[in-house]
Amino acid sequence: RKIPKVGHTFFQKPESCPPVPGGSMKLDIGIINENQRVSMSRNIESRSTSPWNYTVTWDPNRYPSEVVQAQCRNLGCINAQGKEDISMNSVPIQQETLVVRRKHQGCSVSFQLEKVLVTVGCTCVTPVIHHVQ
Amino acid sequence: GITIPRNPGCPNSEDKNFPRTVMVNLNIHNRNTNTNPKRSSDYYNRSTSPWNLHRNEDPERYPSVIWEAKCRHLGCINADGNVDYHMNSVPIQQEILVLRREPPHCPNSFRLEKILVSVGCTCVTPIVHHVA
């Protein structure tokens, strides 16, 4: 029942809630919005002035088992002539996501949530120049 | 499905795919990594395709704050600091997984939810369509 509600028994758990052992939580990994798709511009990883490659990391004890990581192709950025300009820097852009990790301890299996950092692409930045006194 | 070898002495010697529902330990690994991109780097200002960061807040989601990038310009910043419209600033999008309480009134029951976020922007050469 939603807040506020008259005549509500605040401390009573609804019957429909699953029993959960202490120190854990029930997690349904049937994903909400599973069929949502990324609608990025075409081939931006190749057309970018800070292009990148994709690598698929695969781990059967992680859900989802496939995580795609980007790696910048160059230290510098690609200029209008298609050459690398090392006066600029290609840098990774990162984003956190949650995964579920399966752990085996002897014959028992446990599950743990984990935050992982995914590199999603690269951008071209002006370098920070440190002047030495 | 993929099978994973297990200790041969265990009663069920193979683990197949992840079950639909799992009991998860409360401790979240790497929970305290920095989630604010404004604090972790200033790429959003130094990029040739700079972006602004907007807080997407939902107290009933974990994590409750997700930062969304919006490109500042259609074009990219050139060496003179001006916007060059011969190039395009485009968002880099990523699907991430978050937690949502489900059923919503239950204290210890959650479901994974996939959401699409724009993480930053990159400068690209435009696709030019020639009209016959």
Epitope: K2, I3, F10 | E60, R61, H105, C106
Partner: nanobody
Framework: EVQLVESGGGLVQPGESLRLSCKAS????????LGWFRQAPGKEREGISC????????YYTDSVKGRFTISRDNSKNTVYLQMNSLKTEDTAIYYC????????????????WGQGTQVTVSS
């Protein structure tokens, strides 16, 4: 024993301030969102503020926005409610409650509740 204990209530005049504390024992607040609720005599319980577990983002009901501030100190296993510019209509029993990971608009989602502390605002 798992419990939440509120303190800091009392009798104040309108316009004055109070700081409520809620200390958890028997469990760690690290993975819990903390909410403050209040119940005035003859009225239903209302949620007034919540602070998330992931990034300590704070949320408030309209009637207390700008006057109340929720904060947490995980090292002390405590959550606070700083109440400024108190009004007579803030008179109520104040409860704190803990919900796993996220705030919720459902009372039932809160696993642990305190016994409450009385706040009276009167001239």
């Amino acid at each position: 024993e798992v419990q939440l204990v509120e303190s800091g209530g009392g009798l104040v005049q309108p316009g004055e301030s109070l700081r409520l504390s809620c200390k958890a024992s028997g469990f760690s607040l690290d993975y819990y969102a903390l909410g403050w609720f209040r119940q005035a005599p003859g009225k239903e319980r209302e949620g007034i503020s919540c602070i998330t577990s992931s990034d300590a983002s704070a949320y408030y009901t309209d009637s207390v926005k700008g006057r109340f501030t929720i904060s947490r100190d995980n090292s002390k296993n405590t959550v606070y409610l700083q109440m400024n510019s108190l009004k007579t209509e803030d008179t109520a029993i104040y409860y704190c409650a803990a919900a796993l990971l996220t705030c919720s608009s459902y009372y039932d989602a809160y696993t642990y509740w305190g016994q409450g502390t009385q706040v009276t605002v009167s001239s």
